[in-house]
Amino acid sequence: FQTFKGLKWDHHNITYWIQNYSEDLPRDMIDDAFARAFAVWGEVAPLTFTRVYGPEADIVIQFGVAEHGDGYPFDGKDGLLAHAFPPGAGVQGDAHFDDDELWSLGKGVVIPTYYGNSNGAPCHFPFTFEGRSYSACTTDGRNDGTPWCSTTADYDKDGKFGFCPSERLYTEHGNGEGKPCVFPFIFEGRSYSACTTKGRSDGYRWCATTANYDQDKLYGFCPTRVDATVVGGNSAGELCVFPFVFLGKQYSSCTSDGRRDGRLWCATTSNFDTDKKWGFCPDQGYSLFLVAAHEFGHALGLDHSSVPEALMYPLYSYLEGFPLNKDDIDGIQYLYGRGSKPDPRPPATTTTEPQPTAPPTMCPTIPPTAYPTVGPTVGPTGAPSPGPTSSPSPGPTGAPSPGPTAPPTAGSSEASTESLSPADNPCNVDVFDAIAEIQGALHFFKDGWYWKFLNHRGSPLQGPFLTARTWPALPATLDSAFEDPQTKRVFFFSGRQMWVYTGKTVLGPRSLDKLGLGPEVTHVSGLLPRRLGKALLFSKGRVWRFDLKSQKVDPQSVIRVDKEFSGVPWNSHDIFQYQDKAYFCHGKFFWRVSFQNEVNKVDHEVNQVDDVGYVTYDLLQCP
């Protein structure tokens, strides 16, 4: 073994933060792969690993592609799979994974299933059905076009199956409440019998969830078929089309016919002979667990090993079972000793307390896999017969919803505001006091001044303006601000006081007592609008329902933030809505959550983090 410049962590309770995710695996599987990868080292050395939810973690885990913010760009598929930095502050100790790889458990793409009789178990590839081998979901044996797979190696023997993610089962995001696509559907007078990207510039495939989009305006996004998304060839990123014709013969799954190298491929139209469009089918992928265990070895201070059987050897090979070799164990014990594990109490970091139960994990992307009320039967052809017509509840809302890409520009609400010198640059502000969308512009408040950010070309940034000039009664330091989308009243909070502005008229300051908040609530960190004059009010890891008209909280409604918004910092100091997304700020960073405040969603449905970024670079678009 070799160590890295003698560098190691000076403490044994290591914290880690999963900053973002790959689309290749369900989030709970990614969480689990990382937890198991850390546990490998914790088994043989006196180390504990605690997941936290902020950038102060020792080891920040990130998926990225090509140039991803450090000096070591990734190189596309294969080759360099991931990299890690040795222990230390900042980027040191972090582990980055190349998201141009196919991340799996080492045995092919992981496809969760729905309904069927396997309780959500992932597909098993390859599987045998009627004596043939399948390496992707198939519609064979069905007449409704719904793709399915076996969840064991042999469907003929075991009869275990589930339905693959498909627009025929459900859609994601949009406003169609997760209902399946309706085919054909009408869009701009034309009929569509498959998902389309028409009308969108971002490439997302969508469909109508009623027969007529023009009339009903209801839609959803089509689930990605990762089992059938090709790489290479001349159609990278397109979906396999099954069945397809090659040399006059029909194929219902990927094939190696016509190739000497044995690689599986498919056509991306129904007829290869005429269209010549094709790509390689997804391969076995790389085990996220094994690669992570190797990278975490680096992040703990181990350099590469010259022992080919060691986990720290610099070449990837898939293996099952406990991955450490004696050389790996000797190395980690040289750095951290052999002693028993330390007391597994979480470190006193600001983002892990107080969480009386286990810290929240990101909402898994697998919707509930409840059995349908009528269990499907096996049809005469041996394939599973259609499942229920009702779809599973919609998945987390993470994709962009359509609508204007920029908010309406704000009118000039500043009464003779005066600008500071250009040197007062908001890009130099580490942490803003409050951020809020007011009159369509994002307002950034700091120390009695504010800037307005209009998301359009030209000069999007205005200010700084004196806060007290525009809203005369306000103190210099604010905790949060919020504009009621219905009445356009603006709420400001500072300490235990609230001010409400209607234009220039102010009501307040009012004590938080008047809102029904007890003395333990020392500040309000933000509000998010809900339908029909309601909002969510946040403070110190808790959230209440708040009536904007009566300006009272419902004391019975209080819950922990992570029950409703999984994966955001419990102690976010500023929470606001912008362009129909909720933002939770902690330090220089924000966690963005997609949620639909107009749609009647089930109370306490866990909303999904879909982005993490810098307030200055990503929201203010600082250079």
């Epitope: 410049k5 560098l7 000096g71 070591y72 080759g79 040191q92 590469h304």
Partner: antibody, heavy 124, light 107 residues
């Protein structure tokens, strides 16, 4: 002992081509990222291109993108730079350099071994 | 891209004196900075990697310090063979960049 030996430089007319080679010895060549760095007469250092140990996708400075191609033959322990459509401003001493980092452990920063350089002169 | 500014452009000192060379980055690069020495007609030689670690075979009179945006190369007591051009190079962000160099000459 680590050694890097460049060859292939010379005088070429604008629009012409040259292929530089760098023979490596004394280390496990296939494990390390390799770089070309150039230095115009009397000027500072400028990175030209890098190829990762995997030999996969490569990276180029904007000034040479589309004209230069870096490659490596790990079985021969040799790094190459194919230079096409040469311009007068490409005149420089070209060095091959070994990255101190290798593979996925990226704490190192620095080029710990350099070749002696080969002069490329582009002139009519 | 990150710009590295070295100062002074030229430093005139006598053997035995202490030399302090500066390299400033246009944005934070953590500790991803290296220092090289180049003598006329020779290839650059790595002195310091990761801001403060001496490369193999480099005498102890050379030391590096700094983190973020401000970095310093110090030669505690100049020897005649130390008079050369010194370059800093960053890899805190892509693409890598070099400073314009500081010429250390005999006074």
């Amino acid at each position: 002992e680590v050694q890097l030996l460049e060859s292939g430089g010379g005088l070429v007319q604008p629009g012409g081509s040259l292929r530089l080679s760098c023979a490596a010895s004394g280390f496990t060549f296939s494990w390390y990222d390799m770089w070309w760095v150039r230095q115009a007469p009397g000027k500072g250092l400028e990175w030209v291109s890098v190829i990762y140990s995997s030999g996969g996708p490569t990276f180029y400075a904007d000034s040479v993108k589309g004209r230069f191609t870096i490659s490596r033959d790990n079985s021969k322990n040799t790094l190459y730079l194919q230079m096409n459509s040469l311009r007068a401003e490409d005149t420089a001493v070209y060095y091959c350099a070994k990255d101190r980092a290798y593979g996925d452990y990226v704490g190192w920063n620095g080029f710990d071994y350099w070749g002696q350089g080969t002069l490329v002169t582009v002139s009519s | 891209e990150i710009v590295l500014t070295q100062s002074p452009a030229t430093l005139s000192l006598s053997p035995g004196e202490r030399a302090t060379l500066s390299c400033r980055a246009s944005q934070s690069i953590s500790s991803f900075l290296a220092w090289y020495q180049q003598k006329p007609g020779q290839a650059p030689r790595l002195l310091i990697y990761d801001a403060s670690y001496r490369a193999t075979g480099i005498p102890a009179r050379f030391s590096g310090s700094g983190s973020g945006t401000d970095f310093t190369l110090t030669i505690s007591s100049l020897e005649p063979e130390d008079f050369a051009v010194y370059y800093c190079q960053q890899r805190g962000n892509w693409p890598i960049t070099f400073g314009q160099g500081t010429r250390l000459e005999i006074k």
